[in-house]
């Protein structure tokens, strides 16, 4: 669809005569008839196949025709066509004299014709005007013409319809050839697909408007390139959605079981050495001078009763000093100047001569100790209770009060709640500080794996076209991650099917 435009510029009829040579009375009141038709090697009368147009009286005898496109649109003359412009044409321009006001052909005498010109040739669509001048013996006509496309039509022959739009069926303007030119941020054959945020993951992200990055199920992050771990995953990561791969030192289905209490909590104080001894369990080995489950208590050097034979201990900055009773000497009052004759053994201890009576040794009754049986036995001084057990003196003996999860004379045995195989259907048992936890096989759940649930949603291979299947353990459903070029909940459909209609 387009318009053939003809701009009449000047008509010269100096003598004011008709084609017959007869003069016009009082002058030649001139109007024009234009016939546009298909190309003819020799332009002949017949239907004006491309259209006709007539002007009103434009002047008398000789005159210039003013550009009137802004007014009534009479000049240039418009010959619209609703077909593909063929690139060739024939044009007939007739100048007529109008004796009266009726310009219809049937109202004019045949000899009212002033002049007739006929041209033909090639004409490409374009904005540039072609200037032409046709001269006869008595008249001269100067004019220009061109072919332009109608609004929304483009291309070499005005055959391509294109209407700019900016809605959800396209975001584009039209190029001179009728092709679409997408607005910034849009792509696709019809510019209806937004260009997502730069770097947005091709499979795991998408967008509904430019520079956006919306994540598909199981993915997160600004560029949708971070997987979402299993719901409840505490100290773990994922490489594909809904995984929970435990960080070092953590275990269990949700990576919430602390296998490295020492590193994560540093419970041992005062430079003690920490040893992991099970889940949330540890043992501190204290440096000299410290005691307590976490070596948090500072020992006085006298607390170990280093002075023997009744010597009294005095703390000093650099250690301790023993004040020995009469008859004893040495760093720890360990040397005696006494013999059995001096009855040195207390609390019913028996004296035995040694080294030909130069010194002696006391044999102490139960519950007493020391070189002179002067000390009541404290069976807890050596911290015999393991795993943080509390030592209690009970008369002639001692006992260990164990922390939960431990047993044995010295709390050296870990109580296993798993010993009675409490997990049903092949579940794996894990000892916890205050009980146990069962990790259930696929298809079972519950505290003891006693509840039968649905099997792995991905087991039936529901995803097509080599898509990756992820099981969402929290909902027992699957998510298909489609390869490029496929869509659908199971990735079963290729993108962009060919057109089809219901007829």
């Amino acid at each position: 669809s387009g318009v053939f435009q003809l701009q009449l510029q000047e008509f010269i009829n100096e003598r004011g005569v008709l084609a017959s040579g007869r003069p016009c009375e009082p002058g030649c009141r001139t109007f024009f008839r234009v016939c546009l038709k298909h190309f003819q090697a020799v332009v002949s009368p017949g239907p004006c196949t491309f259209g006709t147009v007539s002007t009103p009286v434009l002047g008398t005898n000789s005159f210039a025709v003013r550009d009137d496109s802004s007014g009534g649109g009479r000049n240039p003359l418009q010959l619209p066509f609703n077909f593909t412009w063929p690139g060739t044409f024939s044009l007939i321009i007739e100048a007529w004299h109008a004796p009266g006001d009726d310009l219809r052909p049937e109202a004019l005498p045949p000899d009212a014709l002033i002049s007739k010109i006929a041209i033909q040739g090639s004409l490409a669509v374009g904005q540039n005007w072609l200037l032409d001048e046709q001269t006869s013996t008595l008249t001269r006509l100067r004019y220009s013409y061109r072919v332009i496309c109608s609004d929304n039509y483009y291309g070499d022959n005005c055959s391509r319809l294109c209407k700019k739009r900016n809605d959800h069926f396209g975001h584009y303007v039209c190029q001179p050839d009728g092709n679409l030119s997408c607005l910034p941020g849009w792509t696709g054959e019809y510019c209806q697909q937004p260009i997502c945020l730069s770097g947005c993951h091709e499979q795991n992200g998408y967008c509904s408007k430019p520079a956006e990055c919306l994540c598909r199920p199981g993915w997160q992050g600004r560029l949708c390139n971070e997987c979402i771990p299993h719901n409840g995953c505490r100290h773990g990561t994922c490489s594909t959605p809904w995984q929970c791969t435990c960080d070092e030192g953590w275990g269990g289905l949700f990576c919430d079981q602390d296998l490295n209490y020492c590193t994560h909590h540093s419970p041992c104080k005062n430079g003690a050495t920490c040893s992991n001894s099970g889940q949330r369990s540890y043992t501190c080995t204290c440096r000299p001078g410290y005691t307590g489950v976490d070596c948090e208590l500072e020992l006085s050097e006298c607390d170990s009763n280093p002075c023997r034979n009744g010597g009294s201990c005095k703390d000093q900055e650099d250690g301790y000093h023993c004040l020995c009773p009469p008859g004893y000497y040495g760093l720890h009052c360990e040397h005696s100047t006494l013999s059995c004759a001096d009855s040195p053994c207390f609390n019913g201890g028996s004296c035995r001569e040694r080294n030909q009576g130069a010194n002696y040794a006391c044999e102490c009754p139960p519950n007493f100790t020391g070189s002179n049986c002067e000390k009541k036995v404290d069976r807890c001084t050596s911290n015999p209770c393991a795993n943080g057990g509390q030592c209690l003196n009970r008369g002639p003996s001692r006992m260990c009060r164990c922390r939960p999860g431990f047993t044995g004379t010295y709390c050296e045995l870990h109580v296993s709640d798993c010993a009675r195989n409490p997990c049903a259907h092949g579940g794996t048992c894990h000892d916890l500080e205050n009980g146990l936890m069962c990790t259930c096989p696929a298809g079972f759940s519950g505290r003891r794996c006693e509840v039968r649930t649905s099997i792995d949603a991905c087991a039936s291979s529901p995803c097509f076209n080599r898509a990756t299947c992820y099981t969402d353990l929290s909902t027992d459903t699957f998510v298909c991650n489609c390869p490029y070029g496929f869509v659908g909940s199971r990735c079963e459909f290729p993108v962009g099917l060919p057109p089809s209609f219901p007829w």
Epitope: R165, D167, H168, Y190, F493, G496, P499
Partner: antibody, heavy 121, light 106 residues
């Protein structure tokens, strides 16, 4: 061949929410070429476009109904749905779902058979 | 809001040409579609992109669109063409239908 089928209650009480579902068969709702629309026709009246949705979830609504309309899509079921809240007798109409084709410049080449929804107490 | 205006009714004798107009501001700058709806049936697309016919639609249906008016022309009208006809266009992101024209084949 593509087919669209509307489903939902035929009677809704005033002030309640009208809910309809359109099930698409014979083609994928996730095809980037199509938008999926809802159109209604009151008894003896003309067609009124309600809104449409793209498979990504992008929605477009008629401004005159926007405050009451919600359209959603479930690609796994190949369905899209319409919810119209606070209905009155004026909302009594035959509701159609249709496929709008980008290549047809937004023309709707496939329609459901329509379902009559009456708003009455 | 954008409006499309159609004549309520058009009458035509069998074999004659029926023309239905659809007017809207600068409608020629938008793509017009036309739908045929017979009583008790869903609408059927008969013209899209101003003048294109979907496959299965008879050649007697044609369309044009320029200025403020789109026109659906049924040449050689047949009794089976008696129906309501709706024009439709998109204004930004909103679908707009004309009020409809009832074509009666006398």
């Amino acid at each position: 061949e593509v087919q669209l089928q509307e489903s939902g209650p035929g009677l809704v009480k005033p002030s309640e929410t009208l809910s309809l579902t359109c099930t698409v068969s014979g083609g994928s709702i996730s095809n980037s070429r199509y938008h999926w629309g809802w159109i209604r026709q009151s008894p003896g009246k003309g067609l009124e476009w309600i809104g449409d949705i793209y498979y990504t979830g992008s929605t477009y609504y008629n401004p005159s109904l926007k405050s009451r309309v919600t359209i959603s899509v479930d690609t796994s079921k190949n369905q899209f749905s319409l919810k119209l809240s606070s209905v009155t007798a004026e909302d009594t109409a035959v509701y159609y779902c249709a496929r709008e084709d980008v290549i047809l410049r937004g023309g709707s080449d496939y329609w459901g058979q329509g379902t009559l929804v009456t708003v009455s107490s | 809001s954008y409006e499309l205006t159609q004549p309520p009714s058009v009458s035509v004798s069998p074999g004659q040409t029926a023309s239905i107009t659809c007017s809207g501001q600068r409608l020629g700058d938008k793509y017009a579609s036309w739908y045929q709806q017979k009583p008790g049936q869903s609408p059927v697309l008969v013209i899209y992109e101003d003048s294109k016919r979907p496959s299965g639609i008879p050649e007697r249906f044609s369309g044009s669109n320029s200025g403020d008016t789109a026109t659906l022309t049924i040449s050689g009208t047949q009794p089976m063409d008696e129906a309501d006809y709706y024009c439709q266009a998109w204004d930004r992101d909103t679908g707009v239908f004309g009020y409809g024209t009832k074509v009666t084949v006398l």
